[in-house]
């Protein structure tokens, strides 16, 4: 994200009366983790538990339907991206616990954080793709009937993954392990060194393609979808509005700190006080962004429960209703009453 993505305690406590035992790898000031790091660890732990279980369940539910149901393709890809992101969390967790020391080697430094980034961007871009699909379903139903197929859905997913890969390449190329002399510590991060312009370019492209564009897509698509469904009394639902607002708002809220700090740090000198302050908040911003990886299954379940009236079905059954039903008027992660009624009938018939 930044010039060199790490934080450590400051070592400004030396004076003639205070000479440390310097046999220990890290000095006594670093025995306690910073508050932002503690918060990040808590978030990582929760996201890992909810994300792994929730997304694994979504993958299991959608995998069987993905060959014939387009919605299942969307949610399968989204869940795979989120699931893979969550699997990398123990690595980040371990590093933060060790005061950002990276004991996993150079290859792991290049690959693991880059994989995390790949999966996180894939989930964002897939979300944007899904919203575009919902938009077309509502406003171009005839076109959808003719051209909207599983093949096209898989191509769209491949494009999303490809773009995510492109966004990740700079991070992979510039990622290095640095062993600091004192206090002895190995750090993993991106180092643009001589290329501040490229660092800024990467940050701007990442902001636009990985945040502003998907956000714009989500906002425009869902605004139009809401206006259309709102204008038809039969499909009006405050729950629909709430779910749609939840999708867009969660995306915006959880990614905003990461993107804002990222763009700011690319324009700041690494030795400046603002940079150092933002660097201390880096783990917290990353953990905040990671909430996106576990929020989707929660929204699905809440949406499914809300519209079923009460939880009469098992969780997999509920998720199957929410994720795999094909309809022409249903928005991504938002379900009108009429649609859910149809889904319930079809599920009972299976």
């Amino acid at each position: 994200m930044n010039s060199f993505n790490y934080t450590t305690p400051d070592y400004g406590h030396y004076d003639d009366k205070d000479t440390l035992d310097l046999n220990t790898p890290v000095d006594k000031t670093s025995n306690t983790l910073r508050v932002p790091d503690i918060l990040a660890l808590v978030i990582f732990a929760v996201v890992f538990l909810v994300g792994v279980l929730g997304n694994a369940l979504v993958v299991w539910v959608t995998a069987f339907e993905a060959k014939r149901t387009i919605n299942a393709i969307w949610f399968l890809n989204l869940a795979v991206a989120d699931f893979l992101s969550c699997l990398a969390l123990p690595i980040l967790f371990t590093s933060i616990v060790q005061h950002h020391h990276w004991p996993f080697g150079g290859a792991a430094c290049s690959i693991l954080p880059s994989l995390i980034l790949l999966n996180m961007y894939a989930s964002i871009l897939l979300l944007a793709t899904i919203s575009a699909d919902r938009f077309l379903l509502v406003f171009k139903p005839i076109w959808c009937q003719n051209f909207r197929g599983a093949g096209l859905a898989w191509i769209a997913c491949a494009v999303a993954w490809g773009l995510a890969l492109l966004l990740t390449i700079p991070s992979f190329l510039y990622r290095v392990v640095r062993e600091e002399y004192f206090p002895p510590k190995v750090l993993c991060g991106v180092d643009y060194s001589h290329d501040k312009r490229r660092e800024r370019a990467v940050a701007i492209v990442r902001l636009v393609l990985g945040f502003l564009w998907p956000l714009l897509t989500l906002t425009i698509c869902y605004t139009f979808i809401l206006l259309r469904t709102w204008s038809r009394r039969a499909t009006r639902s405050t729950k629909t509005l709430k779910v749609v607002v939840a999708v867009v708002a969660s995306f915006f809220i959880f990614w905003l700190p990461y993107q804002v700090t990222g763009i700011m740090m690319s324009f700041l000198e690494p030795s400046s006080p603002t940079f150092l302050l933002l660097n201390k908040l880096d783990s917290l911003c990353v953990s905040f962004a990671y909430i996106n990886c576990c929020i989707n299954p929660i929204i699905y379940v809440v949406a499914g429960q809300g519209f079923q009236g009460r939880l009469r079905k098992s969780l997999p059954s509920l998720l199957r209703n929410v994720l795999t039903e094909e309809s022409v008027v249903r928005e991504s992660k938002s379900f009108t009453r009429s649609t859910v009624d149809t889904m319930a009938q079809k599920t009972q018939a299976v």
Epitope: Y181, P270, F275
Partner: antibody
Framework: QVQLQQSGAELAKPGASVKLSCKTS????????MHWIKQRPGLGLEWIGY????????KHNQKFKDKATLTADRSSSTAYMQLSSLTYEDSAVYYC??????????????????WGQGTTLTVSS | DVVMTQTPLSLPVSLGDHASISCRSS???????????LHWYLQRPGQSPKLLIH???NRFSGVPDRFSGSGSGTDFTLKISRVEAEDVGIYFC?????????FGSGTKLELK
């Protein structure tokens, strides 16, 4: 005042070992790390490693990991570097240099404030 | 390893002239604590190196104020405002941010 007095010039044969010394005075020996630096004509300065005399913790440049052994004798306030399996490439001037731990905010043992006068090692058959 | 590239290799000057030596590192020398551990040493003929400047721009005790250091990240400069006879020798830049600690190849300051 602070002094780092190094042992005299050494002449050794290839394959042999030598032990260079750096006797300190004028400061508390255990409060400062001692570094060793190699200088060959036309090849600049090379960092070998350091020892923390208070607990004999050492850190080496990987390049010298199997070449140099760093030790310290707290009773005589002397640091030692033993060079083993000598080759012609080991012919150089070797310096000991100390690093301060007490120069104010944001500082640690980062720069060499005092150097020894150097020991010339000649490896020749 | 961090490669320290010094320019020029040789710098012939006249007494009272200004002199400038450049040092560039292959990686950023900004430590995770925000400090930059780039130092300058002078090795006079037949002597051991002496510290001139530490942490980019801080003069060591006893160093005349005609010596000044500047720079950030990867690019650093040592300036001598009015060269005196005692300034002759080899100037080394050195980094102690990352392991292994490394030195520049040296710049030989000599009188014309």
């Amino acid at each position: 005042q602070v002094q780092l007095q190094q042992s005299g010039a050494e002449l050794a044969k290839p394959g042999a070992s030598v032990k260079l010394s750096c006797k300190t005075s004028g400061y508390t020996f255990t409060n400062y790390w001692m570094h060793w630096i190699k200088q060959r004509p036309g090849l600049g300065l090379e960092w070998i490693g350091y020892i923390n005399p208070s607990g004999d913790y050492t850190k080496h440049n990987q390049k010298f990991k199997d070449k140099a052994t760093l030790t310290a004798d707290r009773s005589s306030s002397t640091a030692y570097m033993q060079l083993s399996s000598l080759t012609y490439e080991d012919s150089a001037v070797y310096y000991c240099a100390r690093v301060p731990l007490s120069y104010g905010s944001g500082n640690g043992p980062y720069y060499f404030d005092y150097w020894g006068q150097g020991t010339t090692l000649t490896v020749s058959s | 390893d961090v490669v320290m590239t010094q320019t020029p290799l040789s710098l012939p000057v006249s007494l009272g002239d200004h002199a400038s030596i450049s040092c560039r590192s292959s990686q950023s020398l900004v430590h995770s604590n925000g400090n930059t551990y780039l130092h300058w040493y002078l090795q006079r003929p037949g002597q051991s190196p002496k510290l001139l400047i530490h942490k980019v721009s801080n003069r060591f005790s006893g160093v005349p104020d005609r010596f000044s250091g500047s720079g950030s990240g990867t690019d650093f400069t040592l300036k001598i405002s009015r060269v005196e006879a005692e300034d002759v020798g080899i100037y080394f830049c050195s980094q102690s941010t990352l392991v292994p600690l490394t030195f520049g190849s040296g710049t030989k300051l000599e009188l014309k």
